[in-house]
């Protein structure tokens, strides 16, 4: 039995007058109906309309509307389609060619795309092939002359060169934009260390320990600072190019004027900080003036901060100068900061530098110095020695070398010495000693000791100090002096008086105003006693005020 055909559901198209015709379905084999296709679709004959036929096997054609693809939908960079047709129907293939030096993703000079149900199968791609690159201080490890996308080319450095941080081999990859990088090797001495730090700024990337030549690092400034110069530095021959500077863009804060104030400063304070270009009147304290020499002026906010930078300059008065053995000839009595004044020394006197005149400067805290006129040093008197130079007068800090006569020495085998001209004259006398006049260690004393570490040899006029043990009294000079090979008389350490409870009980007495069981008194000290309760004096009243004499005390007695 012949199957009838149901109403045809045409994808991407439809029957003409389909509403009227729908009523007459199903239809018998042999029936034909006109139909049309939607935009971008055509009948198998290539027309926008045709007939659909009911056959024994169903509707024919089975796919009434075929997809079309337009040549204009193809975007091809670095390539072209040579075919003249502008419309392609479903499953139709078109060839495209790549420009010289470019290839398909598979590495071919041409490719094809197919018109599919949803449009072209793919967008044609023509990408650059990679040729053998130019090697710098290196060589390729393979022989190929051109390379497809994603191909890897290994290379090695010549002796004494490295690719990066100690590596002598590396690889480059052929990418869509050519080789991933150039096969370059560097002389390691051309590497750079971390880029230099800058004030009020920093690098945008974390600094590395080593950078290859031509590495670039970027800087940025902190808030309120402006970058001046190139923001990049480049590594070249082991050194970085000049880094930028960060210049302050800050507005001006309230000016703290040393030795002066803004007029109406309390009223003005809330309006700070202020922009550059603003000016304010100010005044200076006593003994200070503005740079123009007035007691008031204007202070200006500039890109670099307040101007003048030192608004109030110190003034110095001539009356503050004390000059002994010299004089100031200038008539002016007031001098401002950094002003210099000349002074002269009387004949026979000189400045600390040995000149007849000098200068002092008015500084922030007053005069730079008090002028000094000091006496020159004349040739000194030599003792058992002679000068090694001929000058007759010597400036401050001048050195005069001298030598001892035969058989004499300065100290411990030295036979030459130097003296220095100081503000108080020569540092010491140029004296030499007969070696027999030296002393050995100073003598020991009972109940005392020297205060210094003892030497084996002391030159004449050496001094050594003694001290006594606790409660012992030093009698005589606490110093001994070496003279003619002998020490002067050392001091004595005089015994203290020890007042014991035992001695007081024997005499029925006690210390007046003290409850000590044991009491120490130095020679010459007075010790006051009194009778114990229930006892009466058996010796004179005077004996109760006993005097300590070199460790001995006469006790009073009570019965």
């Amino acid at each position: 039995e012949v199957k009838p055909c149901d109403f045809p559901e045409i994808q991407h198209g439809g029957l003409y007058y389909k509403s009227l015709r729908r009523l007459y379905f199903p239809a018998a084999a042999g029936q034909s109906y006109s139909y049309y296709c939607d935009q971008n679709f055509v009948t198998p004959s290539g027309s926008y309309w045709d007939y659909i036929h009911c056959t024994q096997d169903g509707w024919s054609p089975t796919v009434p509307c075929l997809r079309t693809c337009s040549k204009s939908d193809v975007e091809i960079e670095n390539g072209f389609i040579s075919e003249s047709s502008s419309i392609y129907i479903l499953n139709e293939e078109t060839q495209y060619n790549c420009k010289p030096g470019y290839a398909t993703a598979e590495g071919n000079s041409s490719g094809s795309i197919t018109c599919l149900q949803n449009g072209w199968s793919t967008q044609p791609i023509c990408i650059k092939f990679c040729d053998m690159p130019v090697f710098e201080n290196s060589r390729a490890k393979s022989n190929g002359m051109w390379f497809k996308l994603h191909d890897t080319l290994d290379y090695e450095c010549y002796d004494g060169y490295e690719s990066s941080y100690g590596n002598t081999t590396d690889s480059i990859v052929c990418g869509e934009d050519g080789w991933s990088h150039l096969p370059t090797c560097y002389n390691s001495s051309e590497n750079c260390g971390p880029p230099p730090p800058i004030s009020n700024g920093d690098t945008t990337s974390f600094p590395q320990k080593v950078y290859l030549p031509w590495s670039r690092v970027e800087y940025q400034c902190q808030s309120y600072y402006e970058l001046q110069g190139s923001k990049y530095v480049t590594c070249s021959n082991g050194d970085w190019s000049e880094p930028p500077r960060c210049i302050s863009m800050k507005p001006c804060e309230f000016p703290e004027i040393q030795h002066g104030h803004l007029y109406y400063e309390n009223t003005r304070r809330p309006y700070f900080p202020v922009a550059t270009g603003q000016s304010y009147s100010y005044y200076c304290d006593q003994n200070f003036v503005t740079p123009s020499g007035s007691y008031w002026d204007y202070i200006h906010c500039t890109q670099d901060g307040w101007l003048p930078t030192v608004p109030c300059l110190r003034t110095c008065s001539k009356s503050d100068i004390e000059i002994e053995n010299g004089f100031i000839s200038e008539s002016s009595s007031i001098y401002i900061l950094n002003k210099e004044i000349q002074y002269k020394c009387k004949p026979g006197y000189a400045t600390a530098d040995g000149n007849s005149s000098g200068s002092i400067t008015c500084l922030q805290n007053g005069w730079s110095a008090q002028p000094i006129c000091i006496k020159f040093c004349d040739m000194p008197v030599f003792e058992n020695s002679r000068a090694k130079s001929n000058g007759m007068r010597f400036k401050l800090h001048d050195t005069l070398d001298y030598e001892c006569y035969d058989g004499y020495e300065i100290s411990y085998g030295n036979t030459t010495g130097s003296i220095v001209c100081g503000e108080d004259g020569w540092s010491h006398f140029p004296t030499c000693y007969n070696s027999s006049e030296k002393c050995g260690p100073p003598p020991p004393i009972s109940n005392g000791d020297t205060t210094s570490f003892l030497l084996k040899v002391y030159v004449p006029q050496s001094r050594v100090e003694y001290q006594c043990q606790s409660y012992y009294e030093l009698q005589g000079s606490n110093y001994v002096t070496c003279s003619n090979g002998e020490w002067s008389e050392p001091p004595r350490c005089i015994h203290p008086c020890i007042i014991t409870e035992e001695n007081m009980n024997k005499n029925n007495i006690q210390l007046k105003g003290k409850s000590d069981i044991k009491y120490y008194a130095k020679t010459g000290d007075t010790i006051e006693f009194m009778c114990k309760l229930g006892y009466n004096a058996n010796t004179s009243v005077l004996s109760f005020q006993a005097v300590c004499r070199e460790g001995i005390v006469e006790y009073p007695r009570c019965e």
Partner: antibody, heavy 122, light 108 residues
Framework: QVQLQESGPGLVKPSGTLSLTCAVS?????????WSWFRQPPGKGLEWIGE???????NKNPSLKSRVTISLDKSKNQFSLRLRSVTDADTAVYYC???????????????WGQGTMVTVSS | EIVLTQSPGTLSLSPGERATLSCRAS???????LAWYQQKPGQAPRLLIY???SRATGIPDRFSGSGSGTDFTLTISRLEPEDFAVYYC?????????FGGGTKVEIK
């Protein structure tokens, strides 16, 4: 050729007094020399105790000064060391020594005794 | 008190080699008052160098001293078998006289 010889008890009780003598032979104790005492605990370094000159002048190590007495006997040509209130930390080899004479205010020690071992133990 | 620090603690060398011993002071020492001593087991110290660089009587010229301020050196130019011992530096210019901890020169 000057020679030095230490002598004294090899065992001292804790809190007791260590007494040593150094006999000088081949030269006089009255020369221009400091006569010194040193010690060396077993397996450790050297420590200076103090010194005496023929006039009786002395220098002592401040860390031991309160416990040390150094004296000399010119008639016997010898000098002595007394160390009070000893503890086991005072166990050591004790050396006497003499400094050189070079004309300098201080000199190094060129002549040493062979040393004597003193043990502090009950 | 001047503290003297010697380094190294031990030096392992062969006869004929050069030995360099260091002595560092905690504060400046007058070079007139620095000495070096040699001590062998069971023996008293023996003076080698005084005044930082002067050899004591009878000391072979293979021993030499140098230095000033806080850094001093004892050099033995060619070690002989009898030179293997402990070496101490000492200052003797002020109180208390002190020694370094010693450097042991041993046969490698």
């Amino acid at each position: 050729q000057v020679q030095l010889q230490e002598s004294g008890p090899g065992l001292v009780k804790p809190s007791g007094t260590l007494s040593l003598t150094c006999a000088v032979s081949g030269g006089s104790i009255s020369g221009s020399h400091w006569w010194s005492w040193f010690r060396q605990p077993p397996g450790k370094g050297l420590e200076w105790i103090g010194e005496i000159y023929h006039t009786g002048s002395t220098n002592k190590n401040p860390s031991l000064k309160s416990r040390v007495t150094i004296s000399l006997d010119k008639s016997k040509n010898q000098f002595s060391l007394r160390l009070r209130s000893v503890t086991d930390a005072d166990t050591a080899v004790y050396y006497c020594a003499r400094d050189q004479y070079t004309g300098s205010p201080r000199d190094a020690f060129d002549i040493w005794g062979q040393g004597t071992m003193v043990t502090v133990s009950s | 008190e001047i503290v003297l620090t010697q380094s190294p603690g031990t030096l392992s060398l062969s006869p004929g080699e050069r030995a360099t011993l260091s002595c560092r002071a905690s504060q400046s020492v007058s070079s007139s008052y620095l000495a070096w001593y040699q001590q062998k087991p069971g023996q008293a110290p023996r003076l080698l160098i005084y005044g930082a660089s002067s050899r004591a009587t009878g000391i072979p010229d293979r021993f030499s001293g140098s230095g000033s301020g806080t850094d001093f050196t004892l050099t033995i130019s060619r070690l002989e078998p009898e030179d293997f011992a402990v070496y101490y530096c000492q200052h003797y210019g002020n109180s208390p006289l002190t020694f370094g901890g010693g450097t042991k020169v041993e046969i490698k």
